[in-house]
């Protein structure tokens, strides 16, 4: 019968021929009367056989990632009779893996959005690299992830590629971050190959800023002939948040005379000071009112940022009109 060993050939061998193994029949007594033949895909081109000894050689450089095994057939013939000594038999030559492929991130580009001020440990995104080497062959395709850029705000779990927040971030200081992740095979041991990917992490806004008046003091004038409803001037606050979180409402906090009102222009986010009652120069020609501004929408859990509304003082001078 046939005497079988497992046949392996390392990929990417640079030698012109590499001894793979030997076909042998237990009837072969070594007197050179047997002729060994190799048949099948790769026979004669990738693999050759010494017909007298049965030694098989690989004569081409192999790439396991292209083809990981070859199924060949073996024959042995008695030269003197021309008959088969053994029944034709199928056998396998496996291409053994070497670490010749670096990890690759196939889902690039990566982009994630996470709310600003998210707590430490918040999951941002998972990145995954793949390595074309043999996962069952040592550590050639066993990957470890690490952070090359993004400290101290982000961390990556070494074995999963899960990116998490490691420090709170304020969108108003910086609204996006580029994180660079490296994947190394050989679980990071010497000789490891690596690949990198960039992740764009954008911070979405939360309402962590209250509106604040641009001026702590305003000066307006109103003619004593102005009818009620007259707009006598505008006041303005700013809010470092964006979108809905920056929408604000102005109101009167203090006006003993109850002469003025403030309405909000929601398009410009300005407060418009309105004359609510007609003024009389002879009766009162100087007014002082206090206005306040608050956000239109505030989540319950963000109330700590909005405890005290910003206020401003408005001095209003009445201009005399000569009466006939």
């Amino acid at each position: 019968g046939w005497v079988w060993n497992q046949f392996f050939v390392p990929e990417e061998m640079n030698t012109t021929s590499h001894h793979v193994g030997r076909l042998r029949s237990d009837l072969d007594n070594g007197n050179n009367s047997f002729q060994y033949k190799l048949l099948g895909a790769g026979a004669g081109s990738t693999f050759i056989i010494d017909e007298r000894t049965g030694d098989i050689y690989a004569i081409e450089k192999l790439d396991r990632e292209e083809r990981s095994l070859y199924i060949l057939r073996a024959q042995v013939i008695d030269i003197t009779t021309g008959r088969a000594v053994e029944p034709e038999s199928e056998f396998v030559i496996k291409v053994s893996d070497i670490n010749d492929n670096e990890p690759k991130f196939l889902d690039e580009p990566y982009e994630a959005i996470v709310p600003e001020m998210s707590p430490e440990g918040t999951l941002v995104i998972q990145v995954t690299a793949s390595d074309a080497d043999d996962p069952s062959s040592g550590n050639n395709a066993r990957l470890l992830y690490s952070l090359l850029q993004g400290q101290p705000y982000f961390s990556v779990e070494p074995t999963t590629g899960v990116i998490r927040i490691s420090s709170k971030m304020d969108r108003e200081l910086q609204d996006e971050y580029w994180v660079i992740i490296q994947a190394k095979d050989m679980i990071g041991q010497p000789g490891a190959l690596s690949g990198t990917t960039s992740v764009l992490i954008k911070l979405s806004d939360v309402n962590d800023n209250k509106p604040i008046f641009k001026e702590s003091l305003y000066r307006l004038t109103v003619s004593e002939s102005a009818p009620t409803g007259t707009s006598i001037g505008t006041i303005m606050a700013y809010d470092n948040d964006i979108g809905e979180n920056a929408e604000m409402d102005y109101s009167i906090e203090e006006d003993d005379s109850q002469t003025f009102d403030i309405i909000t222009n929601h398009e410009t986010q300005e407060g418009i000071v309105i004359l609510k009652k007609k003024v009389n120069f002879e009766h009162q020609n100087h007014y002082g009112i206090r206005a306040k501004v608050k956000n239109h929408h505030v989540d319950e859990q963000l109330m700590k940022y909005h405890t005290e509304a910003s206020t401003t003082f408005i001095k209003i001078q009445v201009e005399d009109v000569d009466e006939p």
Partner: antibody, heavy 120, light 107 residues
Framework: QVQLQESGPGLVKPSETLSLTCTVS??????????WSWIRQPPGKGLEWIGY???????YYNPSLKSRVTISVDTSKNQFSLKLSSVTAADTAVYYC????????????WGQGTLVTVSS | EIVLTQSPGTLSLSPGERATLSCRAS???????LAWYQQKPGQAPRLLIY???SRATGIPDRFSGSGSGTDFTLTISRLEPEDFAVYYC????????FGQGTKVDIK
């Protein structure tokens, strides 16, 4: 801290024009919302407001003195000035310059005052 | 114009006593438009109270203001030696007028 300093002649002849200047330091005369006033106090008597000016040049005067008073401002020098024409002995007083407050028209900052005597 | 009348003209008290100074307006004014000043000889007036009960920066809490309509009061809870001076009220709603002053002197 805003500081104000009055300067000008201490003696003015009757029927002439009294001229005083107030120099502001520690803050800008162009600060939004603040008015700059002149107030006087005849010897041994009470306080009388003369008038104020805003940095834009808009002024408002005490009706009883309006015909004789001019207040002007020079933002480049951080100064404002008082001119009171046709003076008489009744205009003899300590003249103060002052700035109003951040929460009303009260007088928060005052100069130390300068005595102007009207006499021939 | 609004006339402010202060009373008494002179108040003679000892250190440690309570001083109550009155200011009456010739017509109603909003309490937000009244201030009190202290003046010592040879010095400029110093703002004490405005609006009518807010203390100016650096003013001790023994000074307090109250009132509404036409009647306003400045109270010094316990007179200190440095409190003996002339006190003026001022309204700043209809132009600017001052009371004639109340002198607080040592008894």
């Amino acid at each position: 801290q805003v500081q104000l300093q009055e300067s000008g002649p201490g003696l003015v002849k009757p029927s002439e024009t009294l001229s005083l200047t107030c120099t502001v330091s520690g803050g800008s005369i162009s600060s939004s919302g603040y008015y700059w006033s002149w107030i006087r106090q005849p010897p041994g008597k009470g306080l009388e407001w003369i008038g104020y000016i805003y940095y834009t040049g808009s002024a408002y005067y005490n009706p009883s003195l309006k015909s004789r008073v001019t207040i002007s401002v020079d933002t480049s020098k951080n100064q404002f000035s008082l001119k009171l024409s046709s003076v008489t002995a009744a205009d003899t007083a300590v003249y103060y310059c002052a700035r109003d407050g951040s929460s009303g028209w009260y007088f928060q900052y005052w100069g130390q005052g300068t005595l102007v005597t009207v006499s021939s | 114009e609004i006339v402010l009348t202060q009373s008494p003209g002179t108040l003679s008290l000892s250190p440690g006593e309570r001083a109550t100074l009155s200011c009456r307006a010739s017509r109603q004014i909003s309490s937000s438009y009244l201030a009190w000043y202290q003046q010592k000889p040879g010095q400029a007036p110093r703002l004490l109270i405005y609006g009518p009960s807010s203390r100016a920066t650096g003013i001790p809490d023994r000074f307090s203001g109250s009132g509404s309509g036409t009647d306003f009061t400045l109270t010094i809870s316990r007179l200190e030696p440095e409190d003996f001076a002339v006190y003026y009220c001022q309204q700043y709603g209809s132009s600017f007028t001052f009371g004639q002053g109340t002198k607080v002197d040592i008894k």
